[in-house]
Amino acid sequence: GSQHIRAEKAMVDGSWLDLAKRSKLEAQPFAHLTINATDIPSGSHKVSLSSWYHDRGWAKISNMTFSNGKLIVNQDGFYYLYANICFRHHETSGDLATEYLQLMVYVTKTSIKIPSSHTLMKGGSTKYWSGNSEFHFYSINVGGFFKLRSGEEISIEVSNPSLLDPDQDATYFGAFKVRDID
Amino acid sequence: GSQHIRAEKAMVDGSWLDLAKRSKLEAQPFAHLTINATDIPSGSHKVSLSSWYHDRGWAKISNMTFSNGKLIVNQDGFYYLYANICFRHHETSGDLATEYLQLMVYVTKTSIKIPSSHTLMKGGSTKYWSGNSEFHFYSINVGGFFKLRSGEEISIEVSNPSLLDPDQDATYFGAFKVRDID
Amino acid sequence: GSQHIRAEKAMVDGSWLDLAKRSKLEAQPFAHLTINATDIPSGSHKVSLSSWYHDRGWAKISNMTFSNGKLIVNQDGFYYLYANICFRHHETSGDLATEYLQLMVYVTKTSIKIPSSHTLMKGGSTKYWSGNSEFHFYSINVGGFFKLRSGEEISIEVSNPSLLDPDQDATYFGAFKVRDID
C-alpha cells in the first residue's frame, strides 16, 4: 500500500515539477523590440515611434503583444522596462538645422480602460553638435520596475527622430515580467 | 492509513519545496564582472577588454564561466545583460591629443559553433573634452534582454580604453538569467 | 482507497501549487522610489538624497523598508539595483554659478553591523552648460546585480542636487530580488 503510494506520488510530483518549472520559467512574458528604420518620422519635434521589429535579429516577444506601435501587456505583473535610444549624425547627411539639440526619450504607459497616457521614464540630454566635427553620436538608457495590468500599452516617444541610429543594437526597448502582483 | 499518508506527503512536499526553491532560485546563472585595470590596453582604437575580476569586491559569478576575457554561458536561457562603462581624464594624467572623442561601448556575442561575432548593444557619445578643463568624466549604461545558448560568449569592446575609469563601481558588466527558453 | 488518496493528493497539490507560486512570485522584494522634490538640498557639493516617495504614483515597495532616506534590505538575496537621475536648468531659474559642472550619481551600500559605506555604482558626466542656451538637460542611468544582506541599506548620492529634475519619471531608483544566495 504505502510503497505503491510513494511510487505514484514520486511520479505525479515529477511531472508536477516539470509543469511547475515550465509554468514558472517559460510562461513569464517578455519583449525586446528593435527599431524599424524603414518608417522613422522626420522632424525635430517629439513623436511616438510606431515601427518596431518583434521577430527578427535580436527582437523577440512572448506572452505580450505588439500592435499599432505599442507593446501590449497580456498578463498582470511587475515588469522591468528598459529602453536604449541612440542618436547620430554624419556631415554627409547634410547640415543640422540647429546645433543646439534636445535628444530625449519618454517611455509611456497608456491605459485603455481609462484613456490616459503617462510617462514612466524619461532620459536624454541637451547637446551642442557643432559643425566643427564630422560625426556626432549620443545614447540614452533608461530602466525601471513597474506594475503593469493586462491591456495596458507601452510606447516610446523621442525628440529628433530623424537622428535615430537605425541599428538593432542601438535603438530598442523591452520588458520582462519579474513577479506577480500580490 | 490516510492520516499516515497525509503526514508522509507533507514531509515529502516539504523537502520538495526546499529542493524546488533551491533549484529555481539558486541555480539561476549570473555574473557581475568589474574591470581589472592592471592590464588596460592603450590607444584610441576600439579594443576588446579582456581583463575583468570575477571574485573580488562586487565581482561575482555563478553557473557561468569567465575565460580568456569572455563571459561564457553554461545554461540556455533568456538573460538580462548590462554594462556600465566610465571614462575619465585628469590633466595630471597627460595631455589629451584631441578634444574630439568617441567614447563608446559594444556588448558582443560570439558563437563558437558558427564562428561569428555580433553586437547586441551599443552606447556612448561623441565628446568635446577641452584642455581648458582640468577634469573630464562620462559614463555609459546599456542593458537588454537576450536569448543566450550554452557555449556562447559575451565580451565588451570600448573605444579609448586608456581613458577607462578603473574603479569597480565605474566600469563593469554583467548578466543574470531571467527565464528558460520555451 | 487509492482513488481517494489520488483525489486528496490532487487537492493538496493544487493548493500547494498556489502557495508555491505565491511564495515564489509574490514574496520577492522590490522597490521603486521616486524623488520627493519638496526637500531637495541646495548647493553643488555631493549630498545624500534622503527624501523619496515609496507609495504614490509609480513609487512602490514590498518586502523592503524605506527609512531615514535609505532603502533597507529585509531579505538576503541577489538584487538588480538601478537608478535614473535627471538634471536640468532653465535660464528662468537664474544664472548657474559655473558653466563647468560635474553631474554625478553614486549608489551606495551601508552595512550597519560593520559601519561602513561603499559605492556600488557610479555614473555621470562633466558638462559645459553655456549661457548661450536657455535650457539644459542631462540624465544618468546605472544598473547592476549585487548580493545584499538583510539590514544593509541602499542610498543615493548626487552632485549638484539643486539641478535635479523633480518629476517621478525623471529621478528615481529601485531594486528587485532576482534570486536567493546559495
Partner: antibody, heavy 122, light 108 residues
C-alpha cells in the same frame, strides 16, 4: 615621408621676442597633435609645449607658461611658437615633433625636425 | 611631477658587447607609458621604443625595452659601431611629459 622643418631661430636679447615656425609635410597635419621640445647646449631634452590637432587645446611646461604661445595654421600645415619675455635660460635648440596619433593622450615624439637654435644673450 | 633618473651616466663598452641602460621613475609610470630615444651628436633624437617594449618602425631587433611601474630597461644585445650615442627615456603617463637626463654609451 613625414618631414618637419623648423625656422625662425636666432640671437635675441633678454626680454625680447621670437617666433618659431615648423613646416610639416607628408601627413594629414590637422589630424595630429604637435609639440615643441628644446635642448640647452650640452644638456638633456625638455618638453616645452603641445597643441591638439584642431588647435583647440594647448599645453605648456611650467617654465614657459605665460611667456610662450603655441599655435598652428592647419591650412598652411605650419606649427608656431611665439616666445616673449625671453631669458638666458631659454637658450636652446628648439625641435618640433609630431605626436603618433595612436593614443588619446599625447605620448612619444616621432619624428623630430632638425631643430633651430635660439640664443638669448645681451 | 615624475622624475626619471637614468643610470649609469656613461657606459663604456666595445662593439659586440651587450648594453643595459636603466631608467628609474620617482613614482609608478601609468600604463607602461615610457619611450626611449637615441641621439647622435648634431642630430635630432630618434624614437627607438614606445610603450616600454614596442620597437618603433625601422628599429633593429637588437634594441629591446622592458619594465613596468618604476623600473625600465633598454637593452642593446650586440653593440654596432653606429649605436654609440646618448639615450634618453621619456614618460608620457602623466603631465608634463618628462625626459631622463640621458645615458651616454661610448666606445671603450
Amino acid at each position: 615621408e613625414v618631414q618637419l622643418l623648423e625656422s625662425g631661430g636666432g640671437l635675441v636679447q633678454p626680454g625680447g621676442s621670437l617666433r618659431l615656425s615648423c613646416a610639416a609635410s607628408g601627413f594629414t597635419f590637422s589630424s595630429y597633435a604637435m609639440s615643441w621640445v628644446r635642448q640647452a647646449p650640452g644638456k638633456g631634452l625638455e618638453w616645452v609645449s603641445g597643441i591638439t590637432g584642431s588647435g583647440g587645446s594647448t599645453y605648456y611646461a611650467d617654465s614657459v607658461k605665460g611667456r610662450f604661445t603655441i599655435s598652428r595654421d592647419n591650412s598652411k600645415n605650419t606649427l608656431y611658437l611665439q616666445m616673449n619675455s625671453l631669458r638666458a635660460e631659454d637658450t636652446a635648440v628648439y625641435y618640433c615633433a609630431k605626436d603618433p596619433g595612436t593614443t588619446v593622450i599625447m605620448s612619444w615624439f616621432d619624428p623630430w625636425g632638425q631643430g633651430t637654435l635660439v640664443t638669448v644673450s645681451s | 611631477e615624475i622624475v626619471l633618473t637614468q643610470s649609469p651616466g656613461t657606459l663604456s663598452l666595445s662593439p659586440g658587447e651587450r648594453a643595459t641602460l636603466s631608467c628609474r621613475a620617482s613614482q609608478s609610470v601609468r600604463g607602461r607609458y615610457l619611450a626611449w630615444y637615441q641621439q647622435k651628436p648634431g642630430q635630432a633624437p630618434r624614437l627607438l621604443i614606445y610603450g616600454a617594449s614596442s620597437r618603433a618602425t625601422g628599429i633593429p631587433d637588437r634594441f629591446s625595452g622592458s619594465g613596468s611601474g618604476t623600473d625600465f630597461t633598454l637593452t642593446i644585445s650586440r653593440l654596432e659601431p653606429e649605436d654609440f650615442a646618448v639615450f634618453y627615456c621619456q614618460q608620457y603617463g602623466s603631465s608634463p611629459r618628462i625626459f631622463g637626463q640621458g645615458t651616454k654609451v661610448e666606445i671603450k
